[in-house]
Interface confidence: low
């Protein structure tokens, strides 16, 4: 499997581009929109018909070091009576994001970009029923 | 967030701050090759809070294509296939990190950018405000 490269682009390279060693790219880790905040409806993870819990994973060799993952609480969905209905399914919704991984070799440090899959929340779906002949 | 400090015994740099700019290997370590949510699952159609996926393309960003979810209804789909307005379809949002070409158009120079994306929708019981 080919590992995707970030550097490829159809643009003509401007003269002002900084020099970069082969096989590398220059990455400024000062984040644009650092203080942007998620403005989701209040505690939707508890009010959803497919509720979920959050867990924080912590890895100091990764940036960002905290990644929040959601886990669906039920296999089924919560009906109007507040009971689990297993004729419906709670399923995870996932999104890819980039992280920077830091590797230590003695006194030198190298950096690698990594795509990670984050489970963001859950949704209630009608199950796919396979009829056996 | 948390960071790992340097090895004890390594020479101290002039600047105690972590460098703002780092050189990163061009290859992205990537276990998840399928980035098209339309191909990865049909939850957006089967959900009781279905959504449409809109393609957001920006060649100055990596990844250049991001799919944005928009809930199809204010309410949720009930067992009869009708929209029930006693429930609400709401977007699930997530902050993700992407790379922004900086300076613009440069092939191998980037800055991290945090963006907010709507990933899908979920059906919730509404918060009812009683007016006195």
């Amino acid at each position: 499997r080919k590992i995707p490269k970030v550097g490829h682009t159809f643009f003509q390279k401007p003269e002002s581009c900084p020099p970069v060693p082969g096989g590398s790219m220059k990455l400024d880790i000062g984040i644009i929109n650092e203080n942007q905040r998620v403005s989701m409806s209040r505690n939707i993870e508890s009010r959803s018909t497919s509720p979920w819990n959050y867990t924080v994973t912590w890895d100091p060799n990764r940036y960002p070091s905290e990644v929040v993952q959601a886990q669906c609480r039920n296999l089924g969905c919560i009906n109007a009576q507040g009971k689990e209905d297993i004729s419906m399914n709670s399923v995870p919704i996932q999104q890819e994001t980039l992280v920077v991984r830091r590797k230590h070799q003695g006194c030198s440090v190298s950096f690698q970009l990594e795509k990670v899959l984050v489970t963001v929340g859950c949704t209630c779906v009608t199950p796919v029923i396979h009829h056996v002949q | 967030g948390i960071t790992i400090p340097r090895n004890p015994g390594c020479p101290n740099s002039e600047d105690k701050n972590f460098p703002r700019t780092v050189m990163v290997n061009l290859n992205i370590h990537n276990r998840n090759t399928n980035t098209n949510p339309k191909r990865s699952s049909d939850y957006y159609n089967r959900s009781t809070s279905p959504w449409n996926l809109h393609r957001n393309e920006d060649p100055e960003r990596y990844p250049s294509v991001i799919w944005e979810a928009k809930c199809r209804h204010l309410g949720c789909i009930n067992a009869d296939g009708n929209v029930d307005y006693h429930m609400n379809s709401v977007p699930i949002q997530q902050e993700i990190l992407v790379l922004r070409r900086e300076p613009p158009h440069c092939p191998n120079s980037f800055r991290l950018e945090k963006i907010l994306v709507s990933v899908g929708c979920t059906c919730v019981t509404p918060i009812v405000h009683h007016v006195a």
Epitope: I29, Y63, P64 | I2, T3, I4, P5, R6, N17
Partner: nanobody
Amino acid sequence: EVQLVESGGGLVQPGGSLRLSCAASGFALGYYAIGWFRQAPGKEREGVSCDSSSDGRTYYGDSVKGRFTISTDSAKNTVYLQMNSLKPEDTAVYYCATCTDFEYDYWGQGTQVTVSS
């Protein structure tokens, strides 16, 4: 001058406990997040725990969750790591360090923890 001095390491049997201390001088603990890291021979350095007093949260690496507890005594300017149910794979040099995101990186000299029967 900023200094972090660890103590409390030693040899312990599997299932046993140890309490590591990290005495900080030259700055107030309330200002920095202070944590514990460990490095076993030939292994990647690993984050054990971090006490982020600014937001009141503590973090633990997956391998130590439920067994190790970090605490801070601001009056003594000391951070502790209570290690219970120790396993041979916990054998490493344990370092106390600031663990704020991409900022200051002050280290102690480390204390050896050996878990063996």
